[in-house]
Interface confidence: medium
């Protein structure tokens, strides 16, 4: 019979014959022959292969380096790579999450709209009228101006987006 020029799915062509690919989680030890099947071996402890393959070496699991702010989100298996994420307070610098940076702070006049997560940075918003933030913080929201009226005081100095109002005593009318 004519030697095949193409093979079925999960097979590969070698020496004019179709051999089975190794399943995910296994690597190729030896190609099939006329008389023997493809020989495959499971990947080692810290290795993986995630496709049907004819690789002779498995890939090393990704290392989540704590010095880069990384920790393991999902432990790798023989068929999947380890997934890293960032420690609390940090977020990934890329989709691959190869390193982390500290969440940014919101400057005075801005408050935290959304606390940062492992994959997204802090979202800041300008403090609207009636609210202020006098610090640079990755956590602090805009806070409402003090209500002088509820303390039976009057506004002596107007508030801004960076400062609270200053309250003072009401002027007493002299008799």
């Amino acid at each position: 019979p004519e030697p095949p020029t193409a093979c079925r799915e999960k097979q590969y062509l070698i020496n004019s014959q179709c051999c089975s690919l190794c399943q995910p989680g296994q690597k190729l030890v030896s190609d099939c022959t006329e008389f023997t099947e493809t020989e495959c071996l499971p990947c080692g402890e810290s290795e993986f292969l995630d496709t049907w393959n004819r690789e002779t070496h498995c890939h090393q699991h990704k290392y989540c380096d704590p010095n880069l702010g990384l920790r393991v989100q999902q432990k790798g298996t023989s068929e999947t790579d380890t997934i890293c994420t960032c420690e609390e307070g940090w977020h990934c610098t890329s989709e691959a999450c190869e390193s982390c940076v500290l969440h940014r702070s919101c400057s005075p006049g801005f408050g935290v709209k959304q606390i940062a997560t492992g994959v997204s940075d802090t979202i800041c918003e300008p403090c609207p009228v009636g609210f202020f933030s006098n610090v640079s913080s990755a956590f602090e929201k805009c806070h409402p101006w003090t209500s002088c009226e509820t303390k039976d005081l009057v506004v002596q100095q107007a508030g801004t987006n960076k400062t609270d109002v200053v309250c003072g005593p009401q002027d007493r009318l002299r008799a």
Epitope: L102, R104, V112, V135, E140
Partner: nanobody
């Protein structure tokens, strides 16, 4: 010169309590986010809790939520960590840390907390 000095660590039985303090100097304490982190024997650094400059906003790692309370006294330039219902896995050196935009830039020397019966 920025200085952070932790105290209050010690040996405590499981279920017990400790209060850690961190005395800060050399910077405007009331303008800074402050954080407690810890390092268990043979392990990496683990974030524990953070507090905003005015002390209005506090955040905790899931592992300590409901058991630990972070607070600060800006008039005394001091950060606190009240630790209740302590467990063996809370054994670690605890550090207070101040941050800049890109990293934790100042650390204390740490205080050792040992939870053991």
């Amino acid at each position: 010169e920025v200085q952070l000095l932790e105290s209050g660590g010690g040996l405590v039985q499981p279920g017990g309590s400790l209060r850690l303090s961190c005395a800060a100097s050399g910077f405007t304490f009331s303008h800074e986010d402050m954080t407690w982190v810890r390092q268990a024997p043979g392990k990496g650094l683990e974030w524990v809790s953070s507090i905003s400059p005015n002390g209005w906003d506090t955040y905790y790692a899931d592992s300590v939520k409901g058991r630990f309370t972070i607070s600060r006294d800006n008039s005394k330039n001091t950060l606190y960590l009240q630790m209740n219902s302590l467990r063996a896995e809370d054994t670690a050196v605890y550090y207070c840390a101040k941050r800049t935009r890109s990293k934790f830039d100042y650390w204390g020397q740490g205080t050792l907390v040992t939870v053991s019966s």
